[in-house]
């Protein structure tokens, strides 16, 4: 596969991953609980996210409450917010770096420097994936640990929410995409013939007197 194709595929995966990460960050489904209230027919589910918590009735009625005070939030939520938002912003920066280093753009002159810019973009996406993976795994660890903690009553036991799974899928796409961008950039630097067109100098037209100019005669 040519480096241009790797670049395009990598960028598409990173963009989808970025979208998934924004979705995971905003969704209130980082941890979910099912709770049966008053009778077994009326099911009530509680969702908790980084920014709000929601209560969903079986009737479909949903009531969400945005967290009031940042200081009142747990360390885990504050750290998860910072890291996830950081990852989203880093992906935004990585997009511009990658576009600048892309073969189809003219921001940077073709050559090894352009390939290095593309490589930087790929590395940024890899870092973005790793950065997002930290809060996702940390949160999942807390949810699982509390689920099996006997001091936590069943009413407070949560399960892994959809946002975590979306987040993990997004980080996988970001890291695979970033890896492909790095591969594409590496192909450019190590095998220029596969990426940049070879510049042949135009042949000089022979003079009327033949191959040699008169000045060559003594």
């Amino acid at each position: 596969m040519g480096s241009a194709a790797l670049e395009i595929l990598g960028l598409v995966l990173c963009l989808v991953g970025w979208g998934g990460l924004i979705l995971a960050c905003g969704l209130p489904m980082w941890q979910v609980t099912a709770f049966l209230d008053h009778n077994i027919v009326t099911a009530q589910t509680t969702w908790k996210g980084l920014w709000m918590s929601c209560v969903v009735q079986s009737t479909g009625h949903m009531q969400c409450k945005v967290y009031d005070s940042v200081l009142a939030l747990s360390t885990e939520v504050q750290a998860a917010r910072a890291l996830t938002v950081g990852a989203v912003l880093l992906a935004f920066v990585a997009l511009f770096v990658t576009l600048a280093g892309a073969q189809c753009t003219t921001c940077v002159a073709p050559g090894p420097a352009k390939a290095r810019v593309a490589l930087t973009g790929g590395v940024l996406y890899l870092l973005c994936g790793l950065l997002a993976l930290v809060p996702l795994c940390w949160f999942a660890n807390i949810v699982v640990r509390e689920f099996y903690d006997p001091s936590v009553p069943v009413s407070q036991k949560y399960e892994l929410g959809a946002a975590l799974y979306i987040g993990w899928a997004a980080t996988a796409l970001l890291m695979v995409g970033g890896g492909l961008l790095c591969c594409g950039a590496w192909v450019c630097t190590s095998r220029p013939d596969l990426s940049f067109p070879v510049k042949y100098s135009a042949p000089r037209r022979p003079t009327a007197t033949g191959d040699y100019d008169k000045k060559n005669y003594v």
Partner: antibody
Framework: QVTLKESGPGILQPSHTLSLTCSFS??????????VNWIRQPSGKGLEWLAS???????YINPSLKNRLTVSKDPSNNQAFLEVTNVDPADTATYYC??????????WGQGVMVTVSS | DIVMTQTPSSQAVSAGEKVTMSCKSS????????????LAWYQQKPGQSPKLLIY???TRESGVPDRFIGSGSGTDFTLTISSVQAEDLADYYC?????????FGSGTKLEIK
């Protein structure tokens, strides 16, 4: 076998602080899953749960007494503690400590009678 | 908080009779994660500390005679003593072990005729 015993002042004046100690044997408050609960029972009345303290230091306190209750532990001496500040005659009761198995109270102390009176 | 309501407040029965007492919770004690009801029963004999009899609605604590039977689901629970013995003279309390704060019923006093 598991045993728990509460100790305290017996009688104290209103607005003072009640300090109770639960000395236990047969388990350690350093062991995973172990907790100690405090419960009280006014004479001739029902049971009221006050607080829990767990092996990892997490505590749960009854919201109706949140500002007045403090629970702590000394696992090395097999002891748990309850402090109730600013007591009044309504705090007169028998105070129990109990071993927790999740949110169940499976072993209870004999109780200590506390009277708040001027 | 979950409010626990016990009825009757007291009842007198003869030895050998069957007795039932009721406990209602203000919200369901059924946890959807394991489909179990988080309700326990305690027995407190005169001058003694409470003793755990039954938990998870119907599971007897070790050493508890099988004449003590717990049943119910959701918000309505029952403790049945199939054949009352003289030593069963006590106060019986239900407790939800579903959420904090842990709450108890006001108790049912069992008297022997």
């Amino acid at each position: 076998q598991v045993t728990l015993k509460e100790s305290g002042p017996g009688i104290l004046q209103p607005s003072h602080t009640l300090s109770l100690t639960c000395s236990f044997s047969g388990f350690s408050l350093n062991t995973y899953g172990v907790g100690v609960n405090w419960i009280r029972q006014p004479s001739g009345k029902g049971l009221e749960w006050l607080a829990s303290i767990w092996w990892h230091g997490k505590t749960y306190i009854n919201p109706s007494l949140k500002n007045r209750l403090t629970v702590s532990k000394d696992p090395s001496n097999n002891q748990a503690f309850l402090e109730v500040t600013n007591v009044d005659p309504a705090d007169t009761a028998t105070y129990y400590c109990a071993h927790a198995r999740a949110q169940l109270l499976d072993y209870w102390g004999q109780g200590v009678m506390v009277t708040v009176s001027s | 908080d979950i409010v626990m309501t016990q009825t009757p407040s007291s009842q007198a029965v003869s030895a050998g009779e069957k007795v039932t007492m009721s406990c209602k919770s203000s919200q369901s004690l059924l946890y959807s994660g394991d489909q179990k009801n988080y309700l326990a029963w305690y027995q407190q004999k005169p001058g003694q500390s409470p003793k755990l009899l039954i938990y998870l609605t119907s599971t007897r604590e070790s050493g508890v005679p099988d004449r003590f039977i717990g049943s119910g689901s959701g918000t309505d629970f029952t403790l049945t003593i199939s054949s009352v013995q003289a030593e069963d003279l006590a106060d019986y309390y239900c407790q939800q072990h579903y959420s904090y704060p842990l709450t108890f019923g006001s108790g049912t006093k069992l008297e022997i005729k």
